[in-house]
Interface confidence: low
């Protein structure tokens, strides 16, 4: 229904504590540079003449459209153009293109130091002296981090966070109450950063019907008891949430999550037996929670797929008639059969029937030609398995570290001209796949590798698409989102590559190494055989690994030793001799 | 009221040292990375360090590394710049600001500003 007032709207819907997150949220998704007092302040105003709406519709400026109301008061920031560039000219655009401008000039990788979490003690002071205010700041510096975070996820992360410092700082030990926890937070909140940000990417590459496949092949798989028609109810509205969100429209998409959330837990009898748990949870946890709930038990009597998609004289018939429909069903169909396959599996082969039908409907003997498609599916089934088996199978073996290094360096081989820094994040984050997937059950490790891999892979694109400098990159980048992680597997040794000469500073080390927390040293050591790999693209394993543990024990010794520096200086250059000597 | 206050400043020969500090009132320095900037007349404000809230980060312009060292004494809700082997290209205005939890890139990142204190460094 229409509403005078749209912001007096999502006033009353979601509440004064939620709406101000939210506007805080999205003013720090869009101006990332400003601080946090700056936007704090412009919250303020916004919240208060909400209030004036809600008070009377019909006074000035109420009937304005969200777009058109946020827009107006972030182009009032003073000094926008020497703070912002060109973003500034958004602001001469009209609705719905000034929008639209904004969210061109979002950066994925804004210029912005990481993210440190002070003491303890000096946190827990902080959040008693005024919990709303340090909270403001979490959200703020999360959120102009990360510009696509799915904003009603980022105010339940700010709720966990609550909790744990609420708990944790009554504590005692404060320090080792907080870290676990709060590392967990974080580990969970990055996740869920890559993967929104691939819904999005998929929403502004391919528009909404891929994500709504994408919807209907996940939905099918964690209720396989609902029907097509409750899946496509729910893929349509997840759909209309999720644009919202990656459009910036976070009231309309927080407000309509809630909504989702409110008719799944009032219809779990067509959707799910496993839902009741998540429903009786408040708001911004049962909204987490639906969204991650486990899989229902999958119905005993499901025919065999090729019946309706094979066997049926009617295929070419029932396709012609509703493609969209009939391809819908197919991707219900096998993907309820299937939770042990990741949605992008599912979807490649949702890909390969549709491609079979347009070929076959065309032929004499449309039967004769689709009759072996399911047998056609194999190859593109056991290629992730494969995958994901050989990867397990060597993190096992070398652990999470050996495991980022082992990916590194098969990475810096397929695409050496990609920035050290850059390769060193995708592979210490495709890295931690690992630790993530390969300890689940065997018939959820496939699901959980390569869905996550390509939500990594997604971020690699996004960066080399501001400075494109692999062809390879390029190549995998520009397909489909479901090929992308096929692609990047298949890359090679990128034999056009010209290798980096050696340099002696690129290698030389100094004493402040030793007393940088492990997982800076882990970095350091990275950069180092990053750099390795490509000044000797076509090193053999064993030589790095002979150069790598030199370096590690280099390190050791003369992070043991009594003079430090001079240990640095005298057993550097020996260090990189014995490396040039070893690539030799 | 939240205010931060730089002392230390002051004339100095080449060569010399001065120690600035940057105190705090109203509010606790622990959740806030501190950074020192500079202004030499008709230029523009110029990073010179700053240290995370957690103390475990520091950086430097390349233009003052290994002479100036950058400290935090949180019980004392102050933080320091020991500046040594000044020279005259040193002389400005040095200012403290805060900004929450960590180190910022740009001027625009800091919450809170002192009003500056003079360093000159002349024979």
């Known amino acids: 229904e229409a509403h005078k007032s749209e912001i007096a709207h999502r006033y009353n819907d979601l509440g004064e504590q939620h709406f101000k997150g939210l506007v805080l949220i999205a003013f720090s998704q869009y101006l990332q540079k400003c601080s946090y007092d700056e936007h704090a302040k412009l919250v303020q105003e916004v919240t208060d003449f909400a209030k004036t709406c809600v008070a009377d519709e019909s006074a000035a400026n109420c009937d304005k459209s969200l777009h058109t109301l946020f827009g107006d008061k972030l182009c009032a920031i003073p000094n926008l153009r020497e703070n912002y560039g060109e973003l500034a000219d958004c602001c001469t655009k009209q609705e719905p293109e000034r929008n639209e401008c904004f969210l061109q000039h979002k950066d994925d990788n804004p210029s912005l130091p990481p993210f440190e979490r002070p003491e303890a003690e000096a946190m827990c002071t902080s959040f008693k002296e005024n919990p709303t205010t340090f909270m403001g700041h979490y959200l703020h510096e999360v959120a102009r981090r990360h510009p696509y975070f799915y904003a009603p996820e980022l105010l339940y992360y700010a709720e966990q966070y609550n909790e744990i410092l609420t708990q944790c700082c009554a504590e005692a030990d404060k320090e080792s109450c907080l870290t676990p926890k709060l590392d967990g937070v974080k580990e969970k909140a990055l996740v869920s950063s890559v993967r929104q940000r691939m819904k999005c990417s998929s929403m502004q590459k391919f528009g909404e019907r891929a994500f709504k496949a994408w919807a209907v092949a996940r939905l099918s798989q964690t209720f396989p008891n609902a029907d097509f028609a409750e899946i496509t109810k729910l893929a349509t509205d997840l759909t209309k949430v999720n644009k919202e969100c990656c459009h910036g429209d976070l009231l309309e998409c927080a407000d309509d999550r809630a909504e989702l959330a409110k008719y799944m837990c009032e219809n779990q009898a067509t959707i799910s037996s496993k839902l009741q748990t998540c429903c009786d949870k408040p708001l911004l946890k049962k909204a987490h929670c639906l969204s991650e709930v486990e899989h229902d038990t999958m119905p005993a009597d499901l025919p065999a797929i090729a019946a309706d998609f094979v066997e049926d004289q009617e295929v070419c018939k029932n396709y012609a008639e509703a493609k969209d429909v009939f391809l819908g069903t197919f991707l219900y169909e096998y993907s309820r059969r299937h939770p042990d396959y990741s949605v992008s599996l599912l979807l490649r082969l949702a890909k390969k029937y549709e491609a079979t039908l347009e070929k076959c409907c065309a032929e004499a003997n449309p039967p004769a030609c689709y009759g072996t498609v399911l047998a056609e599916f194999q190859p593109l089934v056991e290629e992730p398995k494969n995958l994901v088996k050989t990867n397990c199978d060597l993190y096992e073996k070398l652990g999470e570290y050996g495991f980022q290094n082992a990916i590194l360096v098969r990475y810096t081989q397929k695409a050496p001209q990609v920035s050290t820094p850059t390769l060193v994040e995708a592979a210490r984050n495709l890295g931690r796949v690992g630790t993530k997937c390969c300890t689940l059950p065997e018939d959820q490790r496939l699901p959980c590798v390569e869905d996550y891999l390509s939500a990594i892979l997604n971020r690699v694109c996004l960066l080399h698409e501001k400075t494109p400098v692999s062809e390879h990159v390029t190549k995998c980048c520009s397909g489909s989102l479901v090929e992308r992680r096929p692609c990047f597997s298949a890359l090679t040794v990128d034999e056009t590559y010209v290798p980096k000469e050696f340099k002696a500073e690129t290698f030389t080390f100094h004493s402040d190494i030793c007393t940088l927390p492990e997982k800076e040293k882990q970095i350091k050591k990275q950069t180092a055989l990053a750099e390795l790999v490509k000044h000797k693209p076509k090193a053999t394993a064993e030589q790095l690994k002979t150069v790598m543990d030199d370096f590690a024990q280099f390190l050791d010794t003369c992070c043991k030793a009594a003079d430090k520096d001079t240990c640095f200086s005298t057993e550097g250059p020996n260090l990189v001799t014995r490396c040039k000597d070893a690539l030799a | 009221e939240v205010q931060l206050l730089e002392s230390g400043g002051g004339l100095v020969q080449p060569g010399g040292s001065l120690r600035l500090s940057c105190a705090a009132s109203?509010?606790?320095?622990?959740?806030?990375?501190i950074g020192w900037f500079r202004q030499a007349p008709g230029k523009e404000r110029e990073g010179v360090s700053c240290?995370?809230?957690?103390?475990?980060?520091?950086n430097y312009a390349d233009s003052v590394k290994g002479r100036f060292t950058i400290s935090r004494d949180n019980s004392k809700n102050t933080v320091y710049l020991q500046m040594n082997s000044l020279k005259p290209e040193d002389t400005a205005v040095y200012y403290c600001?805060?900004?929450?939890?960590?180190?910022?890139?740009?001027?625009?990142?800091?919450?809170?500003w002192g009003q500056g204190t003079q360093v000159t460094v002349s024979s």
């Open positions: 600001a805060a900004a929450v939890l960590e180190c910022r890139t740009v001027v625009r990142g800091y919450d809170y």
């Open positions: 109203g509010f606790t320095l622990d959740y806030y990375a």
């Open positions: 240290i995370a809230s957690s103390g475990g980060s520091t």
